[in-house]
Each structure stands twice: as structure tokens, then as C-alpha cells.
């Protein structure tokens, strides 16, 4: 009974619910993540426990500092929900649920080029497709390492397309594309495709 009274005596502003967060919210399978459980009251000795559904994953004590739980997301069911419990001697509170979004990384995209050659111009169509990776995928096209398109979002497994017209160039142009989904800091590039300079029959991608 005393413990219950003691807990009731701790006003909500003195011992509110803890906060559970992670710097990484979108992850791929096999990724190591850190989860932070923190509390507004910095002068209490707090025991933090982390749960995934009803499974207890670990316990840490601290005062003034968040508890840091390091874990690896290897299976789909490990996406969550996670919950953190903050406990003082006679009182405990739970955080809101936290879940990760598991995303499959994009594989290196394939760049295809189609060219219609006129006397003065080249009409170039670039196609880029990554056959694996969670949708949506953002594609960006590059010419000589400079982005020439905005990010093109594809919500289906269809190639992104970008058209450009160029005066018949005197120099080689190198094209490549980038595929990126919601995984932060994880982008892949196609192999570069070199478009030869004009002169003779040097247009292997041209439609005759």
C-alpha cells in the first residue's frame, strides 16, 4: 500500500513517462541500431528496461543520462513495437511504442540508353531500373558526374525515364544513374555508359 501511495505522490510532472527513440528509424535486416530511453527528471536514479512486445531485452540504470540499448535487427518481427520502462524504487512508467521500418536496400541499377540522331541533335532517352529494393525508389540521372535530372520517384518496378536533347557533341559524355530508397546513406549507382563523340558511325545506341 505504501508503495502505491508513494507512486501516487510522485506528480506526473516529477515522474512522467520516458521517451524511447532511435537516430535510425529506417533500417535494413542485419543492421545494428541504438535505442535511447530517456527521462525528463535528471536527478532521479532510474532503472530503464527495454521490451519488444513482451520480451525483456535488457535493463540499465542511470541518473541524468539516457539508457542506450544496442541491438541488431535481423528478422522482420524485430521491427517492433519496442517499449521502454522507467522505474524508480516504487513507481514505473512506460514509453510510447516505437517501431522500425525495415527496408530492403536497392541493388545496383541498370542504365539503358536510347538515342535518336538527327543531323544537328541527339535525342537521348535514359532508362534506369533497380530490380531489387523496397519501393518507392528515387532515381537520379548524371552526366559526367553532374546531376541532370531531379529525383524521379517510382512506386512500381518500372524504369525511371529521362529525356534530353543535345547538340551533336564533340566530346564523349558519360552517363550513370543513382537509385536510392528510404534507407539513409545507402545509394547505389549504375555502371557508367559512355556516349562517344560524333563522327562517322560512332553512335552505338542510335536508332537508325
Amino acid at each position: 500500500r505504501k508503495a502505491v501511495l508513494d507512486c501516487e505522490a510522485m506528480k506526473t510532472n516529477e515522474f512522467p513517462s520516458p521517451c524511447l527513440d532511435s537516430k535510425t528509424k529506417v533500417v535494413m535486416k542485419g543492421q545494428n541500431v541504438s535505442m535511447f530511453c530517456s527521462h525528463k527528471n535528471k536527478s532521479l536514479q532510474i532503472t530503464y528496461s527495454l521490451f519488444r512486445r513482451k520480451t525483456h531485452l535488457g535493463t540499465q540504470d542511470g541518473k541524468g543520462e539516457p539508457a542506450i540499448f544496442n541491438l541488431s535487427i535481423t528478422e522482420a518481427h524485430e521491427s517492433g513495437p519496442y517499449k521502454c520502462k522507467a522505474q524508480v524504487t516504487s513507481c514505473s512508467k512506460y514509453s510510447r511504442d516505437f517501431s522500425f521500418t525495415i527496408v530492403d536496400p536497392v541493388t545496383s541499377p541498370v542504365l539503358n540508353i536510347m538515342v535518336i540522331q538527327t543531323e544537328t541533335d541527339r535525342h537521348i532517352t535514359l532508362h534506369c531500373l533497380s530490380v531489387n529494393g523496397s519501393l518507392p525508389i528515387n532515381y537520379t540521372f548524371f552526366e559526367n558526374h553532374v546531376a541532370i535530372s531531379p529525383a524521379i520517384s517510382k512506386y512500381d518496378r518500372e524504369p525511371a525515364e529521362f529525356n534530353l536533347t543535345k547538340k551533336n557533341p564533340g566530346e564523349e559524355e558519360e552517363y550513370r544513374c543513382e537509385a536510392k530508397n528510404r534507407l539513409p546513406n545507402y545509394a547505389t549507382y549504375s555502371h557508367p555508359v559512355t556516349m562517344p563523340s560524333t563522327g562517322g558511325d560512332s553512335c552505338p545506341f542510335c536508332l537508325k
Epitope: 535528471k42 540504470d61 543520462e65
Partner: antibody, heavy 119, light 110 residues
């Protein structure tokens, strides 16, 4: 009356080991964190580490590896295991209950136990 | 580890003087800061805990203030028994942070 009493100090040869005990009375070890602090002769206070209520342990970076803190709640005792001792580990070793804010309680220290590392 | 920088490292003062000792933490330690008084051959004695709370039995001439990284211990009117060494201690601790002591301030008779 709450009390902490250290024991286990004494003379030890360089490279040797020693286990210090901190017997706690009037305090429930499952309700408070207890830390270890040392003071070399003529020097300042040096924080070694702390063991929390649930048993998580944190060390000063210099103490990791050679020093190990543990506790036995049933005996209401906290331990400091010290390995590979060196002359510079000669000091008075104190255990102390950590400050908490509910109920508002200041820290409480033992009287200290002297460890001398010498051949 | 948190670094606690105490200043001055020593000071000379007379009975009745107002004495101020400062302590700066290298990281935010909130209000988790204690002040201790130590006399030769004795265990440290707690004066102030949680930055500003007076420990039991400590005279009211001792006071503490500050939060975050900057803290102050003030003795409003120095008494003969106050000549000693004073230490600050960060008492925050956890996964990413461990406490520590300042190097001490020796208060001597002028």
C-alpha cells in the same frame, strides 16, 4: 542509522590482486546505487565506478579492465576487485551511496580502507 | 568521462571573508553536482548535493548554485573550522557518461 563500512585493504605486491568489500547497513542495495572512489596520498579524489540498483556498472575510462565492481544484494555488500595492481594504485578506497532525489538524500560515505601496493 | 574544472586551485582568506569556488563540467550534468569538504586524514564530508541542497547538519553559511555546466560554492562568512580542501563532483552517470571530481580547492588562512 545508515552506514557503509569498507574492508579488505592492506599491503599487496605489484602485479597482485585484492578484493575490497563495502558492507551496507540501513540501506536497501536494490534501491540505491553505490560507487567507489579513491584518494592517493596527498592527491585529490578519483572516481572509479558505480553499480546501479539493477546491477548495471559504469567505470571511469582509466579503471576499465583492471577494476571490477559487483554486489550481492542478499549480503547487502558491494565489492571492488582490483587486478594487476601497481604502485600508483596505493590509495584510500571509499565506497559511497549515490545521491538520489526521491526521497531527497545526499551521498553517504564509508570511512575508507587503505591499499598499499609495494614490494 | 566528464572533466570537472575547479577554480581556484587554492586561495588564502581571513575569518569572516566571503569565499566563492567555481566548478565547470565538460558536459551537461544538469543539477547533479555535489560539493565536499575534506580535512587531512578524514573522509570527505558532504556539504551540498544536487547543486543547491544543503546536506543535513551543514551550517547555512554554505550555499551552492548553478546547473548544466557551471556551478558555484559560496561560504558567506568564513569560520576557523572551514579551512580545508573543497571538491566538486558530477553525479550524473549512465551509458554515455560517467561522473568525476574537480581537482580540489585548498582554502588556507591568510
Amino acid at each position: 542509522e545508515s552506514q557503509l563500512v569498507e574492508s579488505g585493504g592492506g599491503l599487496v605486491q605489484p602485479g597482485g590482486s585484492l578484493r575490497l568489500s563495502c558492507a551496507v547497513s540501513g540501506i536497501d542495495l536494490s534501491s540505491y546505487a553505490v560507487g567507489w572512489v579513491r584518494q592517493a596520498p596527498g592527491k585529490g579524489l578519483e572516481w572509479i565506478g558505480i553499480i546501479g540498483r539493477s546491477g548495471s556498472i559504469y567505470y571511469a575510462s582509466w579503471a576499465k579492465g583492471r577494476f571490477t565492481i559487483s554486489k550481492d544484494n542478499s549480503k547487502n555488500t558491494v565489492y571492488l576487485q582490483m587486478n594487476s595492481l601497481r604502485a600508483e594504485d596505493t590509495a584510500v578506497y571509499y565506497c559511497a551511496r549515490d545521491v538520489d532525489s526521491r526521497p531527497p538524500t545526499g551521498s553517504l560515505w564509508g570511512q575508507g580502507t587503505l591499499v598499499t601496493v609495494s614490494s | 568521462d566528464v572533466q570537472m574544472t575547479q577554480s581556484p586551485s587554492s586561495l588564502s582568506a581571513s575569518v569572516g571573508d566571503r569565499v566563492t569556488i567555481t566548478c565547470q563540467a565538460s558536459q551537461n550534468t544538469y543539477s547533479n553536482l555535489d560539493w565536499y569538504q575534506q580535512k587531512p586524514g578524514k573522509a570527505p564530508k558532504l556539504l551540498i548535493y544536487q547543486a543547491s541542497k544543503l546536506a543535513s547538519g551543514v551550517p547555512s553559511r554554505f550555499s551552492g548554485s548553478g546547473s548544466g555546466t557551471d556551478f558555484t560554492l559560496t561560504i558567506s562568512s568564513l569560520q576557523p573550522e572551514d579551512f580545508a580542501t573543497y571538491y566538486c563532483q558530477s553525479t550524473s552517470w549512465g551509458s554515455s557518461y560517467v561522473g568525476g571530481f574537480g581537482q580540489g580547492t585548498k582554502v588556507e588562512i591568510k
